[in-house]
């Protein structure tokens, strides 16, 4: 079948990195600079992706594969093949439509992306708070109050000022 196909279509013999040049009796020509073909039998080469501005080159374009981009520091990739770059925030913040905002009381974010999440409620597991939560860190739950030896104390969490939730926008 391969032989039959190549007799019928001389372009099928053109390997990746080349294209079947109709202007030159269908001979296989190398892809021009800044273009590529990732499969054989192509009649054209595709233009290489250019990583500009907030996008930076993660992998250079070759004659057989497209360039790959990622985002410059301060941004993170979104979408297939890093089609978009979204702003990072600091730990203890979340990105809102108006920019980076601090996590409100009772919530935390330990990453540069994502949303502020409520602190763990230790009492739901019958445990006590060993280390208080912050904007950047979740609470650390310790043994249940009953497990504590006499005289030992645990850090009691401050009463929440309001329901944990998203920062006001």
């Amino acid at each position: 079948f391969e032989r039959t196909r190549s007799l019928q279509d001389p372009c099928s013999n053109c390997p990746a990195g080349t294209f079947c040049d109709n202007n030159r009796n269908q001979i296989c020509s190398p892809c021009p600079p800044n273009s590529f073909s990732s499969a054989g039998g192509q009649r054209t080469c595709d233009i290489c992706r250019q990583c500009k501005g907030v996008f930076r080159t993660r992998k250079e374009c070759s004659s057989t594969s497209n360039a790959e981009c990622d985002c410059t520091p301060g941004f993170h990739c979104l979408g297939a093949g890093c089609s978009m770059c979204e702003q990072d925030c600091k730990q203890g913040q979340e990105l809102t439509k108006k920019g980076c905002k601090d996590c409100c009381f009772g919530t935390f974010n330990d990453q540069k992306r994502g949303i502020c999440r409520p602190w763990t409620n230790c009492s739901l597991d019958g445990k006590s708070v060993l280390v208080n939560g912050t904007k950047e860190r979740d609470v650390v739950c310790g043994p249940s109050p009953a497990d504590l030896s006499p005289g030992a104390s645990s850090v009691t969490p401050p009463a929440p000022a309001r329901e944990p939730g998203h920062s006001p926008q």
Partner: nanobody, 119 residues
Framework: QVQLVESGGGLVHPGGSLRLSCAAS????????MSWVRQAPGKGLEWVSD????????DYADSVKGRFTISRDNAKSTLYLQMNSLKPEDTAVYYC????????????WGQGTQVTVSS
């Protein structure tokens, strides 16, 4: 699955107008706040506008306030962005998004439509 397909982009002269559309499927469109975001060449994502589920509350970035109007047709599961008095700095790929910021939720955005404002 969730699909958002933008259309209506193109090349327009400064001062001109365009109307972008976003056809949504795979989720109950009428329950969600919807947003338009954009990415200008070499820049990061910028939130442009959003509209609540019922269509009676809208919000805009300062850079487009008074020029752009967001609307929706829940019966057609379609989001719109009417862009008037366009400026060269509005040149960008415009994305329709089910929620914003995009990286904080599930990956619910479209493939984008290119808007180029040039004389």
């Amino acid at each position: 699955q969730v699909q958002l397909v933008e259309s209506g982009g193109g090349l327009v002269h400064p001062g001109g107008s365009l109307r972008l559309s976003c056809a949504a499927s795979g989720f109950i469109f009428s329950l969600y706040t919807m947003s338009w975001v954009r990415q200008a060449p070499g820049k990061g994502l910028e939130w442009v506008s959003d509209i609540n589920s019922g269509g009676d509350s809208t919000d805009y970035a300062d850079s487009v306030k008074g020029r752009f109007t967001i609307s929706r047709d829940n019966a057609k599961s379609t989001l719109y962005l009417q862009m008037n008095s366009l400026k060269p700095e509005d040149t960008a790929v415009y994305y329709c998004a089910k929620d914003y910021p995009l990286g904080q939720r599930e990956d619910y955005w479209g493939q984008g439509t290119q808007v180029t404002v040039s004389s």
